[in-house]
């Protein structure tokens, strides 16, 4: 609450997240012309990312393009992609949608379609849906430990959200334990308002919010954090302006001498941690 | 404008980047001794790196130490590291521009010169300017969608930069179109007095500030962005406080049973969008 | 200092760090079943991890699982994970302290004790303690070159920490040289208060603070930074919530075929800088 | 699905030549050959892509062999010459999406090179 007579400052603030939990994930794995039920482990090593400060990723989903090599193929047929006769492909033009550089030539996709031929990673990757369910939709149930240390310097005052007297085996809830900083990803969701299985398909950004609201006073002292979540993504984005939260990267490996490459596009939540508030002091 | 009567608060922000756009690369490569003109294709998962919040990176340029293992070679005879016998080399002395630690011995580098052996990951990493033209200077024509998300959580109004009646194909002109939030990397470095070109080669910083003066008051109420662009890093740095934004990383790799790496000295530029402004209320 | 007829505004700053150093590990290495001394060299794109924006990491220390594979396996004995008969396993159960998913079986861990099989990356991660010393403890003698732009968009005005007069060659000291922006890294630690050996064990977080307070009057002119440095982990942090700093990474391969990884478990000192300040003018 | 069919494959003296040839039953980007010795994994030996661009050798047969595309007849084939013991193979058509990637395969012609 405003206290007029307050000299007030604003919060300095340090966070340190660490993310458990395992994912089992089932999918059809096509190892020499055979589709066969592949089942995997993910744990944090394998789905988080790490050093992210005041943000965590947690990957949900992914699509992965395999055993790709720099070389020359027809591009994905996607909308309005496809060509009947070299004079729709542009030699070194660059479409924004496209994975790589048209060579000028209209050549065979498969039986039925021809697009033009591009210099890229091949094959290019297929602009096919995210899995639904997402693969790791079991992610709802790992759980994140918030560490976050305070400073007001102008009031040469430090302090932390994790008090000695705290049991490392609570759960964060809104009324039973509003001070434990354990979450439990989907619980963060339901706070929000949010469907965790449904955000898990396309991605998405949360945001945990610390308010630190500190009466340094030391006749009334108080500074504890309060914590509250929202999404920060827009679900209703329009198509073209990227909905959800995914990015792309690579493995690179050498095979027979020839450099080649894995893209995963990794959809999941990015957690923004929000820190804010201030203390005020006589 | 300063409203004296209102109560001001300062911004909550959240950032989401999407780069966009395909590099194609020309460059001398040796394979077998033998030195030809390689073309390679660059995409997002090539020369941009995850999940940076309020930063994003696209790397512009490159210089590669192939094949380096972990053994004993003379290191590399920059200025002032050349020797003559073994009293100028100190066992255990680890020189801060050098790669590795002094073993005591004064080796041949080549034909006419010696420097001090040393245990490093070998052959050293050759002290060459980085390419110029830049490898990926093309990149000047990529663009970056900006995703930004904004809260006054003492008002309890939040809102973002972009409103669903904008259209997805727009470039951000700072006349023509102010409120579009997909940015040209060229455009952003002219609008700052930059020359893309130039920085591309030694890498830099370049900063995308997004202002919000927000009038929350319902009767004349104002809350957009407004964009401007500044370069960060500092163009007549001295030498010695390492002039431009590179970085170091590596492709470890086993060949032969023999752990290897590549090493990448990538420059870039460092994109920093910093968001701040005010929310005021009667 | 307090000046009641200015208008403070808060510093919109920017960090770009830049790490130098080389540590030698020796480590006891296991090849085919002989355990001998291995000495290895780790520069920067070894211990280090790039693009961080207001925070960087240095590695000093790490536990290594080589040749993890996806498959079945007893997990690790750690304290009340032994069993005696498949009632102690859960068919699908994942323990948060474990690192896989039960199989319902209880199986030989070794000779003497027995635990419930995983599905899991395996063999599993032995839980042992972090080696003391630690590995990088060299990384005392590291150092870091920050660089900090700030600008007070309210007032028109733009500095840095680095001026021209500077010289590349100095070493922060808090009486001899408050101004350079060298830093050693135990020297970080000593103006702390902090054991730099003590903490490389188990990680930790060093904040490193740049406070700004400008007065932009032409008459009295001043904006310098001032550099503090405190601890932001807690070292007397309680077992159950992860005490030190250390993530998992994975460096993954395939071997015959098989897709294996190395897990490595990073120990180490992530270093947040906290710029902060006002900018005032009459 | 792609059927291939290979013809051409024979017994040849070291030093000789042999042409084989494939037709697919549909068009396709790329067209190649890939071989597999007794007891020895399938490796690729030469590939092509549309209209002969781009084309792609293993080291092993750079020289020596020559991979040539026939669009309107959905065909390739491979000239084989200056042959050694070691080209003796079972050699498969496959088709794909680029030089380097291939999904269908047809059942192998024999060749074998005597000494």
């Known amino acids: 609450s405003d206290k007029l007579y307050q000299r007030k400052e604003p919060v300095i603030s340090s966070v340190h997240t660490k993310v458990k939990g395992i994912a089992e994930v089932t999918e059809n794995v096509t190892e020499g012309g055979v589709t066969k039920l592949g089942h995997s482990i993910f744990d944090t090593a394998d789905y988080t990312f790490p050093l992210q400060g005041n943000s965590f990723f947690v990957m949900t989903n992914y699509v992965k393009s395999e055993g790709q090599v720099q070389t020359l193929c027809p591009e994905y047929p996607r909308r309005g992609a496809q060509c009947s006769s070299d004079r729709r492909c542009k030699k070194g033009w660059m479409d924004p949608q496209s994975k790589g550089i048209q060579t000028g030539r209209c050549v065979p996709y498969d039986k039925t379609r021809k697009t033009c031929e591009v210099s890229a990673w091949c094959p290019t990757e297929e602009e096919k849906e995210a899995p639904r369910p997402a693969l790791l939709r079991s992610a709802e149930n790992f759980t994140v430990l918030i560490k976050n240390n305070i400073h007001f310097p102008g009031h040469n005052y430090t302090t932390r959200n994790i008090l000695p007297t705290m049991n490392g085996s609570c759960t964060f809830h809104k009324t039973w334990d509003p001070q434990c900083s354990i979450f439990r990803l989907g619980d963060i969701f339901q706070e929000a308002g949010e469907n965790f299985t449904e955000v898990a398909v396309q991605g998405g950004i949360m945001g945990i919010e610390i308010y630190w609201d500190c009466n340094l006073d030391s006749w009334s002292h108080h500074c504890r954090p309060r914590y509250s979540f929202r999404r920060l993504d827009d679900k209703n984005m329009d198509e073209s302006f990227v909905p959800g939260y995914n990015f792309r990267y690579a493995k690179y490996y050498k095979e027979n001498n020839v450099e080649k490459r894995t893209l995963i596009k990794a959809f999941g939540i990015r957690f923004d941690i929000l820190v804010f508030g201030t203390g005020g002091k006589f | 404008s300063d409203k004296l009567y209102q109560r001001k608060e300062p911004v909550i922000s959240s950032v989401h980047t999407k780069v966009k756009g395909i590099a194609e690369v020309t460059e001398n490569v040796t394979e077998g001794g033998v030195t030809k003109l390689g073309h390679s294709i660059f995409d997002t998962a090539d020369y941009t790196f995850p999940l940076q919040g309020n930063s994003f990176f696209v790397m512009t340029n490159y210089v590669k130490s192939e094949g380096q293992v972990q053994t004993l070679c003379p290191e590399y005879p920059r200025r002032g590291a050349q020797c003559s016998s073994d009293r100028r080399c100190k066992k255990g002395w680890m020189d801060p521009q050098s790669k590795g630690i002094q073993t005591g011995r004064c080796v041949p580098y080549d034909k006419t010169r010696k420097t001090c052996e040393v245990s490093a990951w070998c052959p050293t990493e050759e002290e060459k300017e980085a390419p110029r033209p830049a490898l990926l200077r093309s990149a000047e024509n990529f663009t970056v969608l900006i995703k930004n998300n904004i809260h006054f959580p003492g008002h309890n109004y939040t809102t973002r930069n972009i409103l669903p009646t904008m259209n997805g194909s727009c470039t951000f002109h700072k006349t023509w179109d102010p409120q579009c939030s997909i940015f040209r990397l060229g455009d952003i470095f002219q609008e700052a007095g930059e020359n893309f070109t130039e920085v591309a080669v030694q890498g830099g910083i370049m900063g995308i500030e997004i202002y919000w003066d927000c009038n929350l008051d319902s009767w004349s109420h104002h809350c957009r962005p407004r964009y401007s662009f500044r370069r960060l890093d500092d163009k007549n740095m001295d030498e010695s406080f390492v002039p431009g934004y590179n970085f170091r990383y590596a492709k470890y790799y086993k060949e032969n049973n023999v752990e290897k790496r590549t090493l990448i000295k990538a420059f870039g530029i460092r994109f920093d969008i910093l968001v701040f402004g005010t929310g005021g209320k009667f | 200092s307090d000046k009641l007829y200015q208008r403070k505004e808060p510093v919109i700053s920017s960090v770009h760090t830049k790490v130098k150093g080389i540590a030698e590990v020796t480590e006891n290495v296991t090849e085919g079943g002989v355990t001998k001394l291995g000495h290895s060299i780790f520069d920067t794109a070894d211990y280090t991890f790039p693009l961080q924006g207001n925070s960087f990491f240095v590695m000093t220390n790490y536990v290594k699982s080589e040749g993890q594979v996806q498959t079945l396996c007893p997990e690790y004995p750690r304290r009340g994970a032994q069993c005696s008969s498949d009632r102690r396993c859960k068919k699908g159960w994942m323990d948060p302290q474990s690192k896989g998913i039960q199989t319902g079986r209880c199986v030989p861990y070794d000779k003497t004790r027995k635990t419930c099989e995983v599905s899991a990356w395996c063999p599993t991660e032995e839980e042992k303690e972090a080696p003391r010393p630690a590995l990088l403890r060299s990384a005392e003698n590291f150092t870091v070159l920050i660089k900090n732009n700030i600008h007070f968009p309210g007032h028109n005005y733009t500095t840095r920490n680095i001026l021209p007069t500077m010289n590349g060659s100095c070493t922060f000291h808090k009486t001899w040289d408050p101004q350079c922006s060298i830093f050693r890294l135990g020297d970080i630690f000593q103006e702390a208060g902090e054991n730099f050996t003590e903490v490389a064990v188990q990680g930790g977080i060093m904040g490193i603070e740049i406070y700004w307070d400008c007065n932009l009057d032409s008459w009295s002119h001043h904006c310098r930074p001032r550099y503090s440095f405190r601890r932001l982990d807690d070292k007397n942090m309680d077992e159950s919530f992860v005490p030190g700093y250390n993530f998992r990474y994975a460096k993954y391969y395939k071997e015959n075929n098989v897709e294996k990884r190395t897990l490595i478990k990073a120990f180490g000192i992530r270093f947040d800088i906290l710029v902060f300040g006002t900018g005032g003018k009459f | 699905e792609v059927q291939l069919v290979e013809s051409g494959g024979g017994l040849v003296q070291a030093g000789g030549s042999l042409r084989l040839s494939c037709a697919a039953s549909?068009?396709?980007?790329?067209m190649g050959w890939f071989r597999q010795a007794p007891g020895k994994e399938r490796e690729f030996v030469a590939g092509?892509?549309?209209?002969?661009?781009?084309?792609r050798y293993a080291d092993s047969v750079k020289g020596r062999f020559t991979i040539s595309r026939d669009n309107a007849k959905n065909a390739v084939s491979l000239q084989m010459s200056g042959l050694k013991p070691e080209d003796t193979a079972i050699y498969y058509c496959?088709?794909?999406?680029?030089?380097?990637?291939?999904?269908?395969w047809g059942q192998g012609t024999q060749v074998t090179v005597s000494s």
């Open positions: 496959a088709t794909g999406t680029s030089v380097y990637h291939y999904q269908y």
């Open positions: 549909e068009r396709t980007y790329s």
């Open positions: 092509s892509g549309w209209d002969g661009i781009p084309t």
